[in-house]
């Protein structure tokens, strides 16, 4: 139903959905703190620009009686219930910040007349791609997929002289929300990744994964998985691994690899870690006691959502344009704004762009070292270490299929 927006006459409200079912198990208090920090900065920026307006946030909580799984499984209905609550109260802000679960965002987008922008910290799945009024501030699955295809095809680097066209994907169903959708995208038969690969098999059991490590008849030397080093160790332990196996560990929201005192455990030597560049704000392990790096990224996405709204509000007010219009709703894309930790770039579809970093373990120093970076905005790989001290033969990544000659 048509809901009036509290979004005019110098008073601009942000509706923040505080959902019990969330992409990350983050206390709602921490998200409130992040939103309030963002509001303080936005108010200051607007004042500095000579815009004497009021910006506030309304936190919309669900009752939590029915939708209490805590993860994203029952988020679809929770999101719609919260929208119903907004509708009944006849109170909607200029922008909706909140749904982080792919299920809830997809359903809310489908079931509402979206004449207002929706900003999400999450919504990683492919089903949330290409939504005209949805902005995603954490790297969605599509960005990961494009990196992997780009990297697979690369064959002109000193350390990677073979194109790859095969892969195993380990996916056992216990993944975190981000990993679930990242792996889901790789598994999907209609996805870009599947389309570009000649062979891809999903390993669903621990034993399947463990057997592949030494199986002479394996169809690929490359295994993609998602999680942290501990997750890999639980699965792999100290088992022997064939010398031409390459494990790609997707661990985007974890900047602990970049800390000075971190030593890579021995079981990581066959592993390339894909993570995000820590950017401006690199936390010491002792620094953020209440927030793991992943959770800081989640709360930071809420904060940046507020700053993004402030950025757009400032532009529209300075141009004398109306906020409650489809033009405003569709404007949250193809731009760069000043985020909390530095500039944030959104692509043509409102998805955050970032620098992904591929790390390897140096056999000399037992430290994680940057092998290459990848700019999601231009879909381009930039080699960093031209002569890496790999565990692999001749300090080169092996072919993806054992016994196959140069490509």
């Amino acid at each position: 139903s048509q809901v009036s927006q509290n979004c005019h006459n110098g008073s601009y409200e942000i509706s923040v959905l505080m959902m019990g079912n969330s992409a990350f198990a983050e206390p709602l208090k921490n998200l409130e703190d992040a939103v309030n920090e963002g509001l303080e900065i936005v108010r200051g920026r607007l004042q500095n620009a000579g815009l004497n307006v009021t910006v506030n946030a309304t936190f919309m909580y669900s009752d939590g009686l029915i939708h209490n799984s805590g993860d994203c499984r029952s988020s679809t209905c929770e999101g719609l219930d919260l929208l119903r609550k907004i509708s009944n109260a006849q109170r909607m802000g200029c922008v909706l910040i909140g749904p982080s679960c792919t299920y809830s965002t997809f359903q809310m987008y489908l079931d509402t007349e979206l004449s207002y922008p929706m900003i999400s910290a999450g919504s990683f799945g492919l089903s949330c791609d290409y939504k005209e009024t949805l902005t995603r501030l954490m790297s969605p699955a599509r960005k990961l997929m494009y990196f992997l295809v780009n990297f697979w095809k690369t064959n002109d680097l000193p350390f990677k002289t073979y194109s790859w066209s095969t892969s195993y994907v380990y996916k056992n169903g216990t993944e975190t929300e981000d990993c679930f959708w990242y792996l889901n995208a790789l598994e999907a038969s209609v996805s870009y990744f599947s389309h570009e690969l000649g062979f891809k098999v999903v390993l669903r059991q621990d034993k399947e994964f463990q057997d592949i490590l030494m199986d002479h008849n394996r169809k690929s030397n490359v295994i993609i998985m998602c999680g942290g080093p501990e997750f890999l160790y639980k699965l792999k332990g100290d088992r022997a691994v064939a010398e031409d196996i390459v494990i790609i560990l997707v661990d985007l929201f974890n900047d602990q690899y970049f800390e000075d005192n971190v030593t890579a455990p021995d079981y990581m030597k066959n592993v390339l870690v894909l993570t995000l560049s820590p950017g401006n704000s690199l936390l010491n392990s002792s620094f953020s006691r209440n927030l793991s790096p992943t959770k800081r990224d989640f709360a930071l996405a809420y904060l940046n959502g507020i700053l993004l709204f402030g950025h757009m509000l400032k532009i529209f007010l300075e141009n004398g344009e109306n906020i409650t219009t489809p033009k405003f709703a569709h404007a949250f894309r193809n731009l760069t704004f000043e985020g909390y930790d530095g500039p944030v770039t959104l692509d043509d579809w409102g998805d955050v762009d970032s620098t992904m970093v591929l790390l390897y373990t140096s056999v000399d120093t037992k430290k994680y070292k940057v092998l290459l970076t990848y700019d999601t905005h231009v879909n381009k790989t930039y080699p960093v270490d031209m002569s890496p001290t790999f565990t692999w033969k001749n300090s080169k990544l092996p072919n993806d299929i054992t016994g196959r000659g140069p490509q």
């Epitope: 401006n280 010491n284 620094f287 953020s288 006691r289 904060l303």
Partner: nanobody, 115 residues
Amino acid sequence: QVQLVESGGGVVRPGGSLRLSCAASGFTFSRYWMSWVRQAPGKGREWVAKIKYDGSEKYYADSVKGRFTISRDNAKNSLYLQMNSLRADDTAVYYCATDFTRDVWGQGTTVTVSS
């Protein structure tokens, strides 16, 4: 070990001035927004001022605007708060804090404005 150590508090008459300092260690100071937060007796913590990591943006609570100035010296890992035209309602323990996560707090420095 991450540490924030505030200093410079004291007793001052209404209309007087004080300069608070905060020495930071154990993290890369130049990468973080920093804030001053205060807590008056029997009240909750209240944000006073914040400054961006490179000093290019500074924001103030309405109650202190025009009287307080926040600044930083990244070379010295130090944060400052120049407080002028002090009033009785500025009496509080002043803390510096870093990052929006507000995970690390110093012991605070007490400012008492009294005639």
